[in-house]
Interface confidence: low
């Protein structure tokens, strides 16, 4: 098939913004001699024009010709030709840039069969969902472990989708990992969130030691807690030796002062003395034992012609000290919205953050905060406590950055500052927060919940209430009752069901008259004090066909306490074999008032039940 030789400067690869970035990269020498494994080191890339357009055989091209292909050239090729190109690149060990890999992956529309024939790093850019079967995913992720995951920054969508897919593929449930699991994950183990570090410290900490990028806040806190806890493999900091410090090299930056203080001083001194003679150790040692941001060159002037006139893509080629010297903090503050679109490294972002910190020591203004984007992930809770965030748009913009992740300490602090700044939890704020964090409602105290308007209750889903405790449901239930009051019986029950943990006895009695067939799981979440006064007949009507489930729960609250309150004769009418009711001929006295006055702690229910033998005959009572 003849392919067109003429091609646009940039093809359909990526967004317009990416297109212009690529154009900039080309003009700044993107097509560089890359080091290749086939010995092409230091060779110039051959002229590119039309080189892929019509060769008799792509595999006949030399590594030098293949080295610098632009995205636009690939966008003109058929899928089959793209596959041929990918295989040729792999065979000739051509080292590709991230953009080239992304571009190839974009054009390989269907999941390739011959994974082993493709460039290893190309797999990072393929969608793992395309390899969903157990054999397919195992083959895919076995190859991925050998790829250089760090070609992708941590925030890159391609990287973010790999870890959950890999965990699912290897059958990891929960947060407990084996050594084999960690090995199978390869470089992706460096992305495991803090809960894995907390539960699998013994196997995971030695792996995190060699992760190239910095750990995120969540991982750092978990690693710090695990190291401070003194469990395996390193033991308590007070027992560490110089060899332990060596083994921990990559985790040294996360050690807090409490840990450093508990390491024997002689060990720290010996280790510092030795590491100062070994250049490869100077970086981590400096990181943990001196202030966090250190200028490499204290008062370096900006080189001629390098002063930044605006925040643009050219800055990604600046060294850290050049950014520090050549970017004006005020300029950065006014053009913060541009930072997010530029692929800065973590180290470069640290420099930019430091510049803002110097410009605004009392905390950033909202105009800057709103445009922080991914720089927000670099902020500490201490930084955020200095902010005054009043705009819901600012809150949304920053929550968007953290979307899909668990609530981090930074986000928790941000929300706290926002709500305190507003003085109340209005509907718009609540809607925004529950949209990003479904469990948010249950994270509020009863006092805070009391300011939630009933109209907001309509947006609450059952799973949003999973972590609510009885005191919170006590506040939410009346609001839900008010919100759903105009619905008919069955619809009302569906909506109110998840709030019933806060329902009083009279409402449960009313529900028992409506054939609602409450399931046992809901019944078990009801307030014990609300269940106790219900009669056997009322419970039978309330549960309907589910009443048989009481037998399985007879030893658990509230069923256990309710059984103790019922006459055995009445329980027997259910035909379930429930035992523990009050025998016939006994009188029940409720001494809950007396107990309250005596101040005795009550462990089994709201008021102990005292049964005494009746002195009067049953017939006399009748």
């Amino acid at each position: 098939m003849a392919l067109p030789t003429a091609r646009p400067l940039l093809g359909s690869c990526g967004t317009p913004a990416l297109g212009s970035l690529l154009f900039l990269l080309f003009s700044l020498g993107w097509v560089q001699p890359s080091r290749t494994l086939a010995g092409e080191t230091g060779q110039e890339a051959a002229p590119l024009d039309g080189v892929l357009a019509n060769p008799p055989n792509i595999s006949s091209l030399s590594p030098r010709q293949l080295l610098g292909f632009p995205c636009a050239e690939v966008s003109g090729l058929s899928t089959e030709r793209v596959r041929e190109l990918a295989v040729a690149l792999a065979q000739k060990n051509v080292k590709l840039s991230t953009e080239q890999l992304r571009c190839l992956a974009h054009r390989l529309s269907e999941p390739p069969e011959d994974l082993d024939a493709l460039p290893l790093d190309l797999l990072l850019f393929l969608n793992p969902d395309a390899f969903s079967g157990p054999q397919a995913c195992t083959r895919f992720f076995s190859r991925i472990t050998k790829a250089n995951v760090d070609l992708l920054p941590r925030g890159a969508p391609e990287r973010q989708r790999l870890l959950p897919a890999a965990l699912a593929c290897w059958g990891v449930r929960g947060s407990l990992l084996s050594e084999a699991d960690v090995r199978a994950l390869g470089g992706l183990a460096c992305d495991l969130p803090g809960r894995f570090v907390a539960e699998s410290a013994e196997v995971l900490l030695p792996r995190l030691v060699s992760c190239p990028g910095p750990l995120d806040q969540d991982q750092q806190e978990a690693a710090r807690a695990a190291l401070q806890g003194g469990g395996p493999p390193y033991g308590p900091p007070s027992t560490w030796s110089v060899s332990t410090m060596d083994a921990l090299r990559g985790l040294l930056p996360v050690l807090g002062q409490p840990i450093i203080r508990s390491i024997p001083q002689g060990i720290v001194a010996a280790w510092r003395q030795r590491s100062s003679r070994d250049p490869s150790w100077r970086q981590p040692e400096r990181t943990i034992l001196r202030p966090r941001f250190r200028r490499e060159v204290e008062k370096t002037a900006c080189p001629s012609g390098k002063k930044a006139r605006e925040i643009d893509e050219s800055l990604i080629f600046y060294k850290k000290w050049e950014l520090e010297a050549c970017v004006d903090a005020a300029l950065l503050a006014t053009q913060m919205d541009r930072v997010n679109a530029i692929p800065f490294t973590y180290e470069q972002l640290d420099v930019l953050k430091h510049k803002l910190d110097e410009l605004y020591p009392q905390g950033y203004p909202e105009s800057v905060i709103q445009h922080l984007g991914y720089l927000f992930l670099k902020m500490s809770p201490e930084d955020i406590r200095k902010w005054n965030v009043t705009s819901l748009e600012t809150l949304k913009a920053l929550l968007e950055v953290n979307k899909g992740h668990e609530m981090s300490p930074q986000v928790a602090t941000l929300i706290d500052r926002f709500v305190k700044g507003r003085g109340q939890l209005d509907k718009d704020t609540l809607d925004t927060l529950t949209a990003f964090y479904p469990g948010y409602l249950c994270s509020l105290s009863p006092e805070e919940l009391s300011s939630v308007p009933p109209s907001s209750i309509w947006a609450v889903r059952p799973q949003d209430l999973d972590t609510c405790d009885p005191r919170q449901l006590d506040v939410l239930y009346p609001k839900a009752r008010l919100a759903f009051q105009n619905m008919n019986g069955s619809e009302y029950f569906v909506k109110i069901q998840s709030f019933l943990g806060g329902a009083p006895t009279e409402d449960l009695k009313a529900l028992s008259q409506q054939n609602v067939s409450m399931d046992l799981a809901t019944f078990m979440k009801l307030r014990t004090d609300a269940v106790l006064p219900l009669t056997v007949a009322e419970v039978q009507k309330l549960l309907g066909p589910h009443v048989e489930g009481l037998k399985a729960e007879e030893r658990h609250r509230p069923v256990r306490d309710w059984i103790l309150r019922q006459r055995q004769d009445d329980l027997d009418t259910l035909g379930l074999g429930l035992q523990g009711g009050i025998p016939n001929g006994y009188l029940v006295l409720d001494l809950s008032m007396q107990e309250a006055l005596s101040g005795t702690p009550c462990l089994l229910g709201p008021g102990p039940v005292l049964t005494v033998l009746a002195l009067l005959l049953a017939s006399t009572l009748a």
């Epitope: 969130p193 803090g194 809960r195 907390a198 969540d218 806190e221 978990a222 807690a225 809770p381 406590r385 668990e406 609530m407 981090s408 300490p409 928790a412 602090t413 706290d416 709500v419 305190k420 469990g439 249950c442 994270s443 509020l444 105290s445 805070e448 972590t467 405790d469 009885p470 919170q472």
Partner: nanobody, 115 residues
Framework: VQLVESGGGLVQPGGSLRLSCAAS????????VAWYRQAPGKEREFVAS???????SYADSVKGRFTVSKDKAKDTVYLQMNSLKPEDTAMYSC???????????WGQGTLVTVS
């Protein structure tokens, strides 16, 4: 979240102390709050914990002598320590587990010396 423990100090055997663990910078509800202690040269050990619903658990060595409680309105958890013994000497720290179980926050600790 910042945790600040207080209430530690020097006390004679048989005496009492009440430790507090206050959380600042957070309005988030908590699943569990636990007290741990670490004596010089020993490993950190669990002392007591309290869940959102108020249920408590204790290490065997402190059962009947220590009581854990909380004041939700003040975001503070207390450890009432009675009949103190010399072996209770340690640095006492509290840990807050966030409601979604995702993060644990440790305090810096408060020193209790029974002598």
């Amino acid at each position: 979240v910042q945790l600040v423990e207080s209430g530690g100090g020097l006390v004679q055997p048989g005496g009492s102390l009440r430790l507090s663990c206050a959380a600042s910078g957070s309005m988030f509800s908590i699943n569990a709050v636990a007290w741990y202690r670490q004596a010089p040269g020993k490993e950190r050990e669990f002392v007591a914990s309290i869940n959102t619903d108020g249920t408590t658990s204790y290490a065997d060595s402190v059962k009947g002598r220590f009581t854990v409680s909380k004041d939700k309105a003040k975001d503070t958890v207390y450890l009432q320590m009675n009949s103190l013994k010399p072996e209770d000497t340690a640095m006492y720290s509290c840990i807050y587990c966030r409601y979604d179980g995702e993060f644990a926050y440790w305090g810096q600790g408060t020193l209790v010396t029974v002598s």
